[in-house]
């Protein structure tokens, strides 16, 4: 039960995270015009990974795409790449994790196969989340560097009569969406990896059979503690036959963690 819950929650958290990464990547407000300590402008500038926009005081908004590929800063290209890699890995991870979910039965797929798929999707989510966090952090670092450079420029080179007001940019909403989304995807991936441990059979899980001698009630349990750990591939309580030999599952009266699947 706990494994299923962990896996399901990991899937949902990752799904929300990846949706957030996609949203952040598409958003135009990666950087927004810094309004603090600046002349009051009748326009508001903001930029995304794919286009820059200007909202005029009338409410009219005009956006222009970055139609050049070679003319763009290498850092911006790197951020784009990181975000796209994050989305692709996350999307593949989601696809894999759907088939790995314990609550979804596909033919006679073994739990070991589901465990492997869960681990694979978990790792993909972790890498996806890290890519998003890295991408957003690189962009944020670029903004901070440019912010202080433009601040320095504002107070230098003003010997002439004509002044050019430097437009300074600060963190936009997309950065925060990206950080949160990346974090959620990362957390979801970790949860999937944890769930994988609960699904994976560590050794061959023999059926523990107790033989009832006529005078004594002595049980022979091969496999040591493994028979009762709940990590085995037995998901149903099965009678082997109606005689004296019973499965270990029947001997235990408390439910195992797989009883309610």
């Amino acid at each position: 039960m706990a494994v299923t819950a962990c896996q399901g929650l990991g899937f949902v958290v990752s799904l929300i995270g990846i949706a957030g990464i996609i949203a952040a990547t598409c958003m135009d407000q990666w950087s927004t015009q810094d309004l603090y300590n600046n002349p009051v402008t009748a326009v508001f500038n903001y930029q995304g990974l794919w286009r820059s926009c200007v909202r005029e005081s009338s409410g009219f908004t005009e956006c222009r795409g970055y139609f050049t590929l070679l003319g763009l800063p290498a850092m911006l290209q790197a951020v784009r790449a990181l975000m796209i890699v994050g989305i692709v890995l996350g999307a593949i991870g989601l696809l894999v994790s759907i088939f790995a979910l314990k609550c979804i039965r596909i033919g006679s797929m073994e739990d070991s196969a589901k465990a492997n798929m869960t681990l694979t999707s978990g790792i993909m989510f972790i890498v996806s989340g890290l890519c998003a966090i890295a991408g957003v952090s690189v962009f944020a670092n670029m903004l901070v560097t440019n912010f202080w450079m433009s601040t320095a420029n504002m107070y230098t080179g003003m010997g002439g009569m004509v002044q050019t007001v430097q437009t300074r940019y600060t963190f936009g909403a997309a950065l925060f969406v990206g950080w949160v989304a990346g974090g959620l995807t990362l957390i979801g991936g970790v949860m999937m990896c944890i769930a994988c441990r609960g699904l994976a059979p560590e050794e061959t899980n023999y059926k523990a059979v107790s033989y009832h001698a006529s005078g004594h009630s002595v049980a022979y349990k091969p496999g040591g503690f493994k028979a009762s750990t709940g990590f085995g591939s037995n998901t149903k309580n099965k009678k082997i036959y109606d005689g004296g030999a019973r499965t270990e599952d029947e001997v235990q009266s408390y439910p195992s963690k797989h009883d309610y699947v």
Partner: antibody
Framework: EVQLVESGGGLVQPGGSLRLSCAAS????????MHWVRQAPGKGLEWVSY????????YYVDKLKGRFTISRDNAKNSLYLQMNSLRAEDTAVYYC?????????????WGQGTLVTVSS | DIVMTQSPDSLAVSLGERATISCKSS????????????LAWYQQKPGQPPKLLIY???TRESGVPDRFIGSGSGTDFTLTISSLQAEDVAVYFC?????????FGAGTKVEIK
């Protein structure tokens, strides 16, 4: 046809108050920012104040802050300018103007103006 | 505040001749975000309110004759009337549309010689 009609001007004594109104028609008033601009007799144009379509943000020329208040009533398609502590130098024709959409913040339609005379 | 300096104060031109008005701003009116200039030109005839002629430094407002030509970028702008007509006698104002307060030039009076 876009129409802006100012009213409320007149003769007022120094230190007095006046409320100017601007009735708008021929366009969706609630979608546009509005300006007040004034022109002293025989002088140039002086921008006074701006109010956005949703009443925020609002901007004023620094020297009039605190004395003049711009407001609007979208339900009545009306723009207002409350002028307090009036001085002789406030004597001017007051125009209301529409902040044009997609015209780089220019003022695309103007009213005929209302004359405010501050004199004792 | 942005200071808009217009020159000349007045201009007398013969009918059919070219009239050129200059406007300089104390700060660049070029917005880096969209590489557009935020400067407008208005025409005011005696006893009338101003009328928008040019916005964005060079775009004519609809209904404005094509003899009115706006040019310039950054801090230096020009309004040219390519062939002056009798109905063009008026005062012309330039306006900063990028920074609040939105400031106007002092105006240039165009007359017929």
């Amino acid at each position: 046809e876009v129409q802006l009609v100012e009213s409320g001007g007149g003769l007022v004594q120094p230190g007095g108050s006046l409320r100017l109104s601007c009735a708008a028609s021929g366009f969706t008033f609630s979608s546009f920012g509005m300006h007040w601009v004034r022109q002293a007799p025989g002088k140039g144009l002086e921008w006074v104040s701006y109010i956005s379509s949703g009443s925020s943000p609002i901007y004023y020329v620094d020297k009039l802050k605190g004395r003049f208040t711009i407001s609007r009533d979208n339900a009545k398609n009306s723009l207002y300018l409350q002028m307090n502590s009036l001085r002789a130098e406030d004597t001017a024709v007051y125009y209301c103007a529409r902040a044009g959409y997609a015209v780089r913040n220019a003022l695309d339609y103007w009213g005929q103006g209302t004359l405010v005379t501050v004199s004792s | 505040d942005i200071v808009m300096t217009q020159s000349p104060d007045s201009l007398a031109v013969s009918l059919g001749e070219r009239a050129t008005i200059s406007c300089k701003s104390s700060q660049s009116l070029l917005n880096v975000g969209n590489q557009k200039n935020y400067l407008a030109w208005y025409q005011q005839k005696p006893g009338q309110p101003p009328k928008l002629l040019i916005y964005g430094a060079s775009t004519r407002e609809s209904g404005v004759p094509d003899r009115f030509i706006g040019s310039g970028s950054g801090t230096d702008f020009t309004l040219t009337i390519s062939s002056l007509q009798a109905e063009d006698v008026a005062v012309y104002f330039c306006q900063n549309d990028l920074f609040y307060p939105l400031t106007f030039g002092a105006g240039t009076k165009v007359e017929i010689k």
